[in-house]
């Protein structure tokens, strides 16, 4: 599959992930800052990464979880909901050695983690602590609990057009 980025030809290749939708044909930047694929007409904004009909933005700046949520909202997106092993692997492969906030929150009264779309996450979150109610990915192969008030990078997600 082809994953769009800032390379000269508008796309770069990455390892194949079995269930990733294949994108065929050449791609070209358009005047409005979007990059299109001729085959399926899917579009991600410049500097966003394409994966399975979704667009992902990995920031270089850092902020708290609340500020990260607002940052993504301002880009017409949400913090990433990383709810499959394939999606996690894809994002791990394109993250630098940094921590990135995602859309996963610990609901203390329920004693469970939920995605920001309210679906339950049944899985492994390391580094859990009574003060760590947010989660990051990037440095380990799993999700890490983190303080919501500390500044980290963030991953935003939205539908490809």
């Amino acid at each position: 599959p082809q994953i769009f980025n800032k390379s000269n030809d508008g796309f770069t290749t990455t390892r194949s992930y079995g269930t990733v939708s294949q994108i065929f044909g050449s791609s070209s930047p358009s005047p409005n800052g979007f990059i299109t694929t001729r085959s399926y007409g899917t579009v991600c904004p410049k500097d966003w990464e394409f994966y399975q009909a979704r667009c992902f933005f990995l920031s270089t700046s850092e902020s708290s979880w609340n500020e990260s949520r607002d940052f993504c909202k301002g880009k017409g997106s949400t913090l990433a909901i990383v709810n499959t092993p394939e999606k996690l692997k894809f994002l791990q492969d394109i993250t630098d050695a940094e921590k990135y906030f995602i859309g996963l929150i610990y609901h203390r009264e329920e004693k469970r983690w939920r995605w920001i779309n309210n679906s339950v996450f049944n899985g492994n979150v390391t580094n859990q602590n009574q003060n760590f109610n947010c989660a990051t990915i990037g440095l380990t192969k799993t999700f890490d609990a983190a303080s919501c008030d500390i500044s980290y990078r963030r991953i935003c997600e939205k539908n490809a057009k």
Epitope: G18, T19, N83, P85, E86, G123, N124, K141, T142
Partner: antibody
């Protein structure tokens, strides 16, 4: 579609070695761990352990330390179970089963069809 | 190790009947429990994951629930293909452990 296809039945003598394969298709092999499960004739299921398909690191349940070895051929999307110095009590059907370490909803979600091992002198 | 006590070990029931199988966990496993179905040819299929979630393609007559440390698989109206073996599996902590199984027989 996702499939785990195991090698065929085996007939071995005590003291011999057997190597059972589990070939995965329909997904990216290295994203999911592979478990091995034993079922002795007329008995229930017993977890033997698992192998991290990304790093190749195996984890064995206490009863399966020593003569048992999990291995991989990543390029062929295949996991292996090897049993050395076979004993009569190894006679069983062995299953492979896929799992995610991180996402519990994907634990033991797909199973191989099983490989019957007969140990007889 | 966590023990999973499954009951009954065998159950005779009639077509169309509603039945429940139970597994009791010796320690807290949260919702980390699967129900598995094993056909006479040995084929194993996951029916329920995370206590109560139905796998895709599994008929809606199957359901899973929890009450404290007791986990149940209920089949609302038995069909002929349901008369096979069922196992629970906890994956909350290693070593992962199975119930001893229930053989569902036609009356």
């Amino acid at each position: 579609q996702i499939q785990l296809v195991q090698s065929g039945p085996e007939l071995k003598k005590p003291g011999e070695t057997v190597k059972i394969s589990c070939k995965a298709s329909g997904y990216t092999f290295t994203i999911y761990a592979m478990n091995w499960v034993k079922q002795a004739p007329g008995k229930g299921l017993e977890w033997m352990g698992w192998i991290n398909t990304d790093t190749g690191e195996p984890t064995y349940a206490d009863d399966f330390k020593g003569r048992f070895a999990f291995s991989l051929e990543t390029s062929a999307s295949t996991a292996y179970l090897q049993i050395n110095n076979l004993k009569n009590e190894d006679m069983a059907t062995y299953f492979c089963a896929r799992s995610s370490e991180v996402f519990y909803d994907y634990r033991f979600d797909y199973w191989g069809q099983g490989t019957a091992l007969t140990v007889s002198s | 190790d966590i023990q999973m006590t499954q009951s009954p070990s065998s159950l005779s029931a009639s077509l169309g009947e509603r039945v429940s199988l139970t597994c009791r966990a010796s320690q807290d496993i949260g919702s980390s429990l699967n129900w598995l179905q094993q056909e006479p040819d040995g084929t194993i299929k996951r029916l329920i994951y995370a206590t109560s979630n139905l796998d895709s393609g599994v008929p809606k007559r199957f359901s899973g629930s929890r009450s404290g440390s007791d986990y149940s698989l209920t089949i609302s109206s038995l069909e002929s293909e349901d008369f096979v073996h069922y196992y629970c599996l906890q994956y909350a902590s290693s070593p992962f452990t199975f119930g001893s199984g229930t053989k569902l027989e036609i009356k």
